[in-house]
Amino acid sequence: HTAAQDNCTCPTNKMTVCSPDGPGGRCQCRALGSGMAVDCSTLTSKCLLLKARMSAPKNARTLVRPSEHALVDNDGLYDPDCDPEGRFKARQCNQTSVCWCVNSVGVRRTDKGDLSLRCDELVRTHHILIDLRHRPTAGAFNHSDLDAELRRLFRERYRLHPKFVAAVHYEQPTIQIELRQNTSQKAAGDVDIGDAAYYFERDIKGESLFQGRGGLDLRVRGEPLQVERTLIYYLDEIPPKFSMKRLT
C-alpha cells in the first residue's frame, strides 16, 4: 500500500472505484454501475451518476415564469443507458420494453411508447431554471450579495464558467438561478449546465456527490441560506413532443 494509492481518489465523485492501474501507473477511477473511466478533475455526467445510484444498495414580477415547453423531472429515478462519452442515449427503455425519448439531462420529452419508438437525436437542454425557496430569515438577503455568492458557488464547487449563469432572480423567499448554455457556446472542457444543476440538486438535498467533503454550507455575508424546496425546469433547444391527452 503506497502513498500513490492513498492519493488515488476521485474528489468530484464518491461513487467510483479507483486504483493506480492506469497508463504508466497513473490513478484511474471508474464509475460504479457502468465501470466507465471518469475524469476526476471535473463533474461526472448525470447519466453515469444516475447509473451508479441505481447500482448502489437501496436505502411586475422579476421572477421568471417557466415557458409552456419547460419540463420538470416527474419520472424520478431510472437506470439509464449512457453512450461511450457518458451522455444519455436519446432513447431510454425499461425492463418491460416501454421506451421514451429524453433530453441531454435525461428528462423524458415524449410520451412513452414501445420498442418501435424512434428518437432521432439527443436534444440539448440549453436553459435550466432552478427555483428555490429559502427558509425564513431575519430579513431579505441583499440581491447583489446573493448573486455573487451563487455565481461563486457554481464556479468554485461545480466548475461552471460564470458566463453560463445567465441570471439570479430574487423575490423573498424565492430565488431563481438561470443557467444557459447553447451547443455552440459549450467548448471542450466546459462543465455541462445539466451536470452542474444535478450536483447542486443533490447538494441541496444533503446528498453530496463529492468525495469526503462536508455538505453544502451556503452563506450570504455570513447568514446561512437554507433551502426548503427546490424545483428545476428544463428547456430544450427543440420543444418536447407530448400528446394532447397528457396536457389535459
Partner: antibody, heavy 122, light 109 residues
Amino acid sequence: QQLEESGGGLVKPEGSLTLTCKGSGFDFSGTYWMWWVRQAPGKGLEWIACIYVGSGSSTYYASWAKGRFTISSTSSTAVTLQATSLTAADTATYFCARGATNNVFMNYFNLWGPGTLVTVSS
Amino acid sequence: FEMTQTPSSVSEPVGGTVTIKCQASEDISSNLGWYQQKPGQPPKLLIYGASTLASGVPSRFKGSGSGTEFTLTISDLECADAATYYCQTSYYIDDGVNGFGGGTEVVVK
C-alpha cells in the same frame, strides 16, 4: 519533495523540443494539476499549459500556446511539454510547477522546479 | 480577462512598508496568490486564497482583498525582501488567459 525540468538548450528557429518535468519525494498520481510556466529574459511569468495528473488527464492551454505546445503525462512520475515551430520569442526559462488543489480554477503553485533555459537561435 | 499589477517598481528603506496592488478585470472571489521571485530562482509562494500565509512565510507579509481588488503589504522591510513579486489567479484559466500580474520589483535601500 522537489521537481526538476530537463530538455532545455539551444534550438534552431522552426525547430522542436520536448521538456520533461520529474518529481521526487512524491508521486504524480495524486489529485492535482501540473503546470508549465515560462519567463523570457528580464520579463514576467507566463502560463503555458496544465494537466490533471489524477484520473482523467484534462488539459488547458494558454490561447497563444494551442496547437504549438502539447502537455502530456504518460507515467506517474513525469509530465512533458512538447513545443514545435519555435521562434526567438520562445526563448525563456521554462518552469514546471505543482498546483496545490484539485480544482483548476482555485489553483496556486506550492512547488516549483528550478527551470530549464531554452534558447531559440540560428 | 486581465491581471493588472501596480506599481511596476518601488523603492523603500529597510524597516519601511511596501504596498503592491493587483486588480482583476473580473470578479475572482478570493482566488489570488502572491509569489516572490529572486534572480536565478523560481518563484516562491507567499500567500494563497488572497490572505492565507503559505508555510514558513513571515507574518510581515500580509495579503488582503477579494473580488477584483487585492493588496500585498510587506512591513518591516528587510534586505532579503528585495525581489520581484507577482500576483496570480487561475479562476479564468479556461479562457486561455495568463493569470499572472506583470510583476513589481521591490528595491530595499
